[in-house]
Amino acid sequence: CDLPQTHSLGHRRTMMLLAQMRRISLFSCLKDRHDFRFPQEEFDGNQFQKAEAISVLHEVIQQTFNLFSTKDSSVAWDERLLDKLYTELYQQLNDLEACVMQEVWVGGTPLMNEDSILAVRKYFQRITLYLTEKKYSPCAWEVVRAEIMRSFSSSRNLQERLRRKE
């Protein structure tokens, strides 16, 4: 399955939207800094089968969509930018879903190693726990926005490697 060029463009647009969403300076939130430990190992290695890489990317985007789709998120961010973000993420999910169905099942057998997906889920669980702990404060959301940008930047590297493999 070849990821369309539009997928890379969508990824770039998502990064731009996340940057535009910034409401306060991260420097004013230094006391709220937190190590969520993005599972970088899941994005660095070349041991990935294509099916696994696509599924991990899908999980990151799905979890990001879920995170910004909450009631608390709609209070924290500009609604117009949020709507654009939903559209971009939704399109990327569609692109990846088409590929997942082709890649994951071969001859009726799933080829997936679930470890990486679980690691990504735990990472987003830590983000949700942090927001709850910080009572969804503006600084907590800003820390999370910056963190999601970092995770998208890492997943972009995996996307590029996928494109080179095609």
């Epitope: 430990r37 190693n113 690691a119």
Partner: antibody, heavy 122, light 107 residues
Framework: EMQLMESGGGLVQPGGSLRLSCVAS????????MSWVRQAPGKGLEWVAS????????YYAPSVKGRFSISRDNSNNTLYVQMNSLGVEDTAFYYC???????????????WGQGTLVIVST | DIRVTQSPSSLSASVGDRVSISCQTS??????LNWYQQRPGKGPQLLIS???TLQSGVPSRFSGSGSGTDFILTIISLQPEDSASYYC?????????FGQGTKVEIK
């Protein structure tokens, strides 16, 4: 009865290599992440590495990254750690440990082996 | 990496005493703080997971409390077999980190 049995420890020269093994029994090995934790004689505990239930999601302590490699064979219920470029600071009891979840983080180390001693010395 | 600070490093108490060991982390670990007991010459054993969940087979005189960055292990009525080293460990993120340990001796 749940059990973890380490083997492969011994005396090795600085710069040398060693491979430790751990055979698990009494639980569904393939369902849980596994770790290695070490303890220098008379000192505290130091986590070394972890591997996910299916052999993915490998994590390492900064002190061993690039030198140690963790792996597992679910068909034989066995956990391994390949240790290269060993230094005197790697001298310790090495414990094989079961985690409470399928991948590392947000869990606990709920079952420990008896440990195997690795001595790095000239 | 998350730093884990445990205190005291050692304590001596009498049978029946109430004993508390403190553990602090350099950032919030939510509830993902575990406590281990290590008797001399043995491997560690998990006593309490997720700050306050007592493991099966562990006597009810042991209890854990706390969340975020501050945690406490309490032994309500110290028994001779509790003579051991106790370690706290954050299981929130890797690298997992342990406290320096607390050696508990019976007077």
């Amino acid at each position: 009865e749940m059990q973890l049995m380490e083997s492969g420890g011994g005396l090795v020269q600085p710069g040398g290599s060693l491979r430790l093994s751990c055979v698990a029994s009494g639980f569904t090995f393939k369902s849980f992440a596994m770790s290695w934790v070490r303890q220098a004689p008379g000192k505290g505990l130091e986590w070394v590495a972890s591997v996910g239930s299916q052999g993915g999601s490998k994590y390492y302590a900064p002190s061993v990254k690039g030198r140690f490699s963790i792996s597992r064979d679910n068909s034989n219920n066995t956990l391994y750690v390949q240790m290269n470029s060993l230094g005197v600071e790697d001298t310790a009891f090495y414990y094989c440990v079961k985690e409470t979840d399928a991948v590392a983080t947000m869990d606990a180390l709920d079952m420990w082996g008896q440990g195997t001693l690795v001595i790095v010395s000239t | 990496d998350i730093r884990v600070t445990q205190s005291p490093s050692s304590l001596s108490a009498s049978v029946g005493d109430r004993v508390s060991i403190s553990c602090q982390t350099s950032q919030s670990v939510n509830i993902y703080l575990n406590w281990y007991q290590q008797r001399p010459g043995k491997g560690p054993q998990l006593l309490i997971s997720a700050a306050s969940t007592l493991q099966s087979g562990v006597p009810s005189r042991f209890s854990g409390s706390g969340s975020g960055t501050d945690f406490i292990l309490t032994i309500i009525s110290l028994q001779p077999e509790d003579s051991a080293s106790y370690y706290c460990q954050q299981g929130y993120i890797t690298p997992y980190t342990f406290g320096q340990g607390t050696k508990v001796e019976i007077k």
